[in-house]
């Protein structure tokens, strides 16, 4: 993986738990930039510092989640620490991954997207609507919308509200869903791919 | 400071193929999805393809689609548009742009690169 | 796929005037619209996304607004560097697609 993700897994890593504690508290109340959203309270504070890492460069990507990671550091007294993470992270310029690609799902675009085409069944099917949100959340859900459906009792009424917002979706951010579906239940997209 | 350098101009006979490269600096290739527009010469923009962060995503115009080949090297920092049966329609600037997320708006373009497309 | 038409095609406004150009989609498109410049000899470059979200760095005499299928650029006082070609994009869905131009030239 990138230098500034691996500086933030070594700096995570060489704190106590109570430490990681009060990291992932101050990370709930820290400024963030315009633009960036908060990770979900409930699935902070169950991480450990290899999934924090994860979130954090998936929300936030290696720059500024380097960067945030320092500050929260900072905040916390670590000046020392978050000045190493600081130095690690400038030393190289945080080289992407190779990436293995998988081969293109999508090369010629249908009438409808594949979420829209299996909304019914989607409802109906999904169980992992907790992982989906967490996917989501940030990139293509508000605080508020993803409040709203894990507020819902059941699964399809989860999927049910999380369909309620696809409306206002263009089509990279249907991809995001999809892209989320095939993590999380791929055995299900392949199933409703042959269908 | 993001930076997109496209490479690969040339003239080729029609039929003919040709590879575009676009070397990306200052940000991490691997998060964005990135797109090839081009622009002919009566000024007139058109999207040409279209590839996701991981490279699981790919769209064509129709016109261009079993002919041009989108792809991107994660590793390397590159995105590449691979061109055979070429036509004298193909003839434009090829510009590689960045798309940022979620919803992937064209937030930087490159210089451009010229193809040529003549007999 | 969704059609957008530009209008005008080209115009010139005094140095001061404020000008509005237009681009109307053949379909709802939410507010996946962007508007572009492109000065001569140069790349285009991104004023405004989302509609009417104004990219850092770009002046705020540009303004972007509309919804559905109607949108329009607005520049509230032009500058003799405004010059140039302004294009719109929707991004709503594939294949994207731009408005055909408008050339904008000094008075």
């Known amino acids: 993986m990138g230098r500034a993700r691996d500086a933030i897994l070594d700096a995570l890593e060489n704190l106590t738990a109570e430490e990681l504690k009060k990291f992932k508290l101050k990370l709930l109340s820290v400024p963030l930039r315009e633009g960036y959203g908060r990770i979900p309270r409930g699935a902070l504070l169950s991480m450990d510092a290899l999934d924090l890492t994860d979130k954090l460069v998936s929300f936030y990507l290696e720059t500024y989640g380097a960067e945030l990671t320092a500050n929260v550091l900072r905040d916390m007294g670590l000046q020392e620490m978050a000045g190493q993470l600081q130095a690690a992270t400038h030393q190289g310029s945080g080289a992407a991954p190779a990436g293995i690609q998988a081969p293109p799902q999508s090369a010629a675009k249908p009438g409808l997207h594949f979420i829209d085409q299996h909304r019914a069944a989607l409802i109906a099917r999904v169980t992992n609507v907790e992982w989906l949100l967490d996917a989501l959340y940030g990139k293509v859900l508000t605080d508020e919308q993803y409040q709203a459906v894990r507020a819902e009792p059941t699964n399809p009424s989860k999927m049910r509200k999380l369909f309620s917002f696809t409306p206002a979706w263009n089509w990279t951010c249907k991809d995001l869903l999809l892209q989320a579906l095939r993590e999380s239940q791929s055995y299900l997209v392949e199933d409703l791919e042959r269908s | 400071d993001v930076k997109l350098v496209e490479s690969g101009e040339g003239l080729v006979k029609p039929g003919g193929s040709l590879k575009l490269s676009c070397a990306v600096s200052?940000?991490?290739?691997?998060?964005?999805?990135m797109s090839w527009v081009r622009q002919t010469p009566e000024k007139r923009l058109e999207w040409v393809a279209y590839i996701s962060s991981g490279g699981d995503f790919i769209y064509y115009r129709d016109t261009v689609k079993g002919r041009f080949t989108i792809s991107r090297d994660n590793a390397r920092n590159t995105l590449y548009l691979q061109m055979s049966s070429l036509k004298s329609e193909d003839t434009a600037m090829y510009y590689c742009?960045?798309?940022?997320?979620?919803?992937?708006?064209?937030?930087?373009w490159g210089q451009g690169t010229l193809v040529t497309v003549s007999a | 796929d969704i059609k957008m038409t530009q209008s005008p095609s080209s115009m010139y406004a005094s140095l001061g005037e404020r000008v509005t150009i237009t681009c109307k989609a053949s379909q709802d498109i939410k507010n996946y619209l962007s508007w572009f410049q492109q000065i001569p000899g140069k790349s285009p470059k991104t004023l405004i996304y989302?509609?009417?979200r104004l990219v850092d760095g770009v002046p705020s005499r540009f303004s972007g607004s509309g919804s559905g299928q109607d949108y329009s650029l607005t520049i509230s006082s032009l500058e003799y560097e405004d010059m140039g070609i302004y294009y719109c994009l929707q991004y709503y869905e594939f294949p994207y697609t731009f408005g055909g131009g408008t050339k904008l030239e000094i008075k």
């Open positions: 989302r509609a009417n």
């Open positions: 742009i960045l798309q940022l997320r979620p919803e992937a708006w064209f937030a930087y």
């Open positions: 200052g940000f991490t290739f691997s998060n964005y999805a």
